[in-house]
């Protein structure tokens, strides 16, 4: 679609006569008829296939024609066409004499023609005017012409329709050749596709307007490049949505089971060494001078009765000191200056000479010990309590204070964790060294088989169009992550294509 524009500039008819040579009365009141048609090797007046237009009376005999386009007038003359411009044309311009105001052919004199010109040739679409001048025996006409495209039509033939728009159907302006030029932030054939925030993940993110980054299910973060872990995941991460890959030292479905109690809680005090021994289970190895499950109790160094032969122990800041009884010496009063003649054995101990009487040895009755039978036997020195139990002296006997999960005189018996039937929903209980383990029936999971789980919801491949399926264990459902161009809970609907355009 376009317009053939004809600008009449000057008409000369000095003698004021018709084409016949007859003088006009009262003068040649001149108007023009223009006929635009398809190319003809010899132009004939037949149907004006591209259009026709007439002017009012523009002047008498000889006159210049005013450019009237700015005022909405009729010069340049407009011959619109609604087809592809063929690049060639024929043009007939007739000058007619109208004695009166009625310009209809039947109202004109029989020989009202003043002049007629016919031209034909090639003409490309463009803004530049072609100037021409045609002379006949009695007249001269100067004019210019061009072909331009109508609004919203572009290209060499005005055949490409392009209407700038900024709405749901596209965001573009039109280039001179009719191709679309997307507005900033838009892309695609019809500039319908927003350009998402720079860096927005190609698969996991999308946008409905430029510089936006909306995340698909299972993804989060400014650029939708962070997966959302399983709901309830405590100490875990994911590489795909709904995963819960436990951090080091954590276990269980939700990574909420502490496998590294030592690191996470540092239970051992006073510089003790901590060893993990199962879930929420640990053992503290105390430094000298400390005791207790967590080595929280400070031991007096004299508690171990290091002084022999009745020596008395004194605590000091950096250790202890033995005050030896007469006849003894040494760090622990272990050296005797006595002989059996000095009756050195206490508590009914019997004395035996050694080294020709230079030394002796005491043979102690039960419950006494020491080089002079001066000590009651400490039944805890041999560490009789197993499994980390604490040994306590109680008069002539001893007792073991057991750690949780153990019993028996020497804490040698493991309490059966399975005794209280901790596994729910018919789970099978297994005693372990440091606790128990439940083997769950189908449809249940968790440490105690307390979590109801469905068969993998993705097992039936419910997602269409190569979508990725994720099982949401917290809701026993699946989530389909659609590839670009598909929507719907199962990605079953293609996104509606834009309507076809006529170019």
């Amino acid at each position: 679609s376009g317009v053939f524009q004809l600008q009449l500039q000057e008409f000369i008819n000095e003698r004021g006569v018709l084409a016949s040579g007859r003088p006009c009365e009262p003068g040649c009141r001149t108007f023009f008829r223009v006929c635009l048609k398809h190319f003809q090797a010899v132009v004939s007046p037949g149907p004006c296939t591209f259009g026709t237009v007439s002017t009012p009376v523009l002047g008498t005999n000889s006159f210049a024609v005013r450019d009237d386009s700015s005022g909405g007038g009729r010069n340049p003359l407009q011959l619109p066409f609604n087809f592809t411009w063929p690049g060639t044309f024929s043009l007939i311009i007739e000058a007619w004499h109208a004695p009166g105001d009625d310009l209809r052919p039947e109202a004109l004199p029989p020989d009202a023609l003043i002049s007629k010109i016919a031209i034909q040739g090639s003409l490309a679409v463009g803004q530049n005017w072609l100037l021409d001048e045609q002379t006949s025996t009695l007249t001269r006409l100067r004019y210019s012409y061009r072909v331009i495209c109508s609004d919203n039509y572009y290209g060499d033939n005005c055949s490409r329709l392009c209407k700038k728009r900024n709405d749901h159907f596209g965001h573009y302006v039109c280039q001179p050749d009719g191709n679309l030029s997307c507005l900033p932030g838009w892309t695609g054939e019809y500039c319908q596709q927003p350009i998402c925030l720079s860096g927005c993940h190609e698969q996991n993110g999308y946008c409905s307007k430029p510089a936006e980054c909306l995340c698909r299910p299972g993804w989060q973060g400014r650029l939708c490049n962070e997966c959302i872990p399983h709901n309830g995941c405590r100490h875990g991460t994911c590489s795909t949505p709904w995963q819960c890959t436990c951090d080091e030292g954590w276990g269980g479905l939700f990574c909420d089971q502490d496998l590294n109690y030592c690191t996470h809680h540092s239970p051992c005090k006073n510089g003790a060494t901590c060893s993990n021994s199962g879930q929420r289970s640990y053992t503290c190895t105390c430094r000298p001078g400390y005791t207790g499950v967590d080595c929280e109790l400070e031991l007096s160094e004299c508690d171990s009765n290091p002084c022999r032969n009745g020596g008395s122990c004194k605590d000091q800041e950096d250790g202890y000191h033995c005050l030896c009884p007469p006849g003894y010496y040494g760090l622990h009063c272990e050296h005797s200056t006595l002989s059996c003649a000095d009756s050195p054995c206490f508590n009914g101990g019997s004395c035996r000479e050694r080294n020709q009487g230079a030394n002796y040895a005491c043979e102690c009755p039960p419950n006494f010990t020491g080089s002079n039978c001066e000590k009651k036997v400490d039944r805890c020195t041999s560490n009789p309590c197993a499994n980390g139990g604490q040994c306590l002296n109680r008069g002539p006997s001893r007792m073991c204070r057991c750690r949780p999960g153990f019993t028996g005189t020497y804490c040698e018996l493991h309490v059966s964790d399975c005794a209280r039937n901790p596994c729910a929903h018919g789970g099978t209980c297994h005693d372990l060294e440091n606790g128990l383990m439940c083997t769950c029936p189908a449809g249940f999971s968790g440490r105690r088989c307390e979590v109801r789980t469905s068969i993998d919801a993705c097992a039936s491949s419910p997602c269409f169009n190569r979508a990725t399926c994720y099982t949401d264990l917290s809701t026993d459902t699946f989530v389909c992550n659609c590839p670009y161009g598909f929507v719907g809970s199962r990605c079953e609907f293609p996104v509606g294509l834009p309507p076809s355009f006529p170019w």
């Epitope: 016949s20 007859r22 004939s44 052919p105 004199p109 029989p110 020989d111 007629k116 006949s136 025996t137």
Partner: antibody, heavy 119, light 106 residues
Framework: EVQLVESGGGVVQPGGSLRLSCAAS????????MSWVRQAPGKGLEWVAD????????YYADSVKGRFTISRDNSKNTLYLQLNSLRAEDTAVYYC????????????WGQGTMVTVSS | SYELTQPPSVSVSPGQTASITCSAD??????VSWYQQKPGQSPVLVIY???TRPSGIPERFSGSNSGNTATLTISGTQAMDEADYYC?????????FGGGTKLTVL
Amino acid sequence: EVQLVESGGGVVQPGGSLRLSCAASGFTFGNHWMSWVRQAPGKGLEWVADISSDGRYKYYADSVKGRFTISRDNSKNTLYLQLNSLRAEDTAVYYCAKAGGGNVGFDIWGQGTMVTVSS
Amino acid sequence: SYELTQPPSVSVSPGQTASITCSADNLGEKYVSWYQQKPGQSPVLVIYQDATRPSGIPERFSGSNSGNTATLTISGTQAMDEADYYCQSWDSSGAVFGGGTKLTVL
């Protein structure tokens, strides 16, 4: 139906006079130029005169100028040609014709009326 | 005075194309009309403004005009086309007719 019907022809002596009439019907007579064209026996067509729609403008062939007069009565839809000082060479069939405006030519013709100038 | 020159006669076989010319100085600058006249009948306008056919005139009649010559062309000539043909234009004194051409369909 568009129609032109001439009348008034006949035989007349040289120097004599005749008045030809042309009755128009089927179109708006007052809007059109009208003409008289004649054809001598065995000869070609010759334009005689024409008159504008309102009767203001009248044109004549050189051969009849000063002797013939064209006129019209739009109220009666009738065209006239007064023939005076007739000569032998004026002998012809006289046709009344509607002149199409704007160089269309003579688009409607009457059947003609014969004028014979003879002594 | 302005004279339009036509050949007195043209012959053509049925179904063939007949061309009748009309010549005058700078005739292409003017409009030419053509008339058909059969014996004993009034003339009938067959072409006006060089090449335009009035309604009712068969398509086999066509016209052209350029330079000094106007041409009436009858393609696929039929026996009923046998007639006298006159070209007509205008000069300063009024309408001018050519001398006429007798078309004979053999």
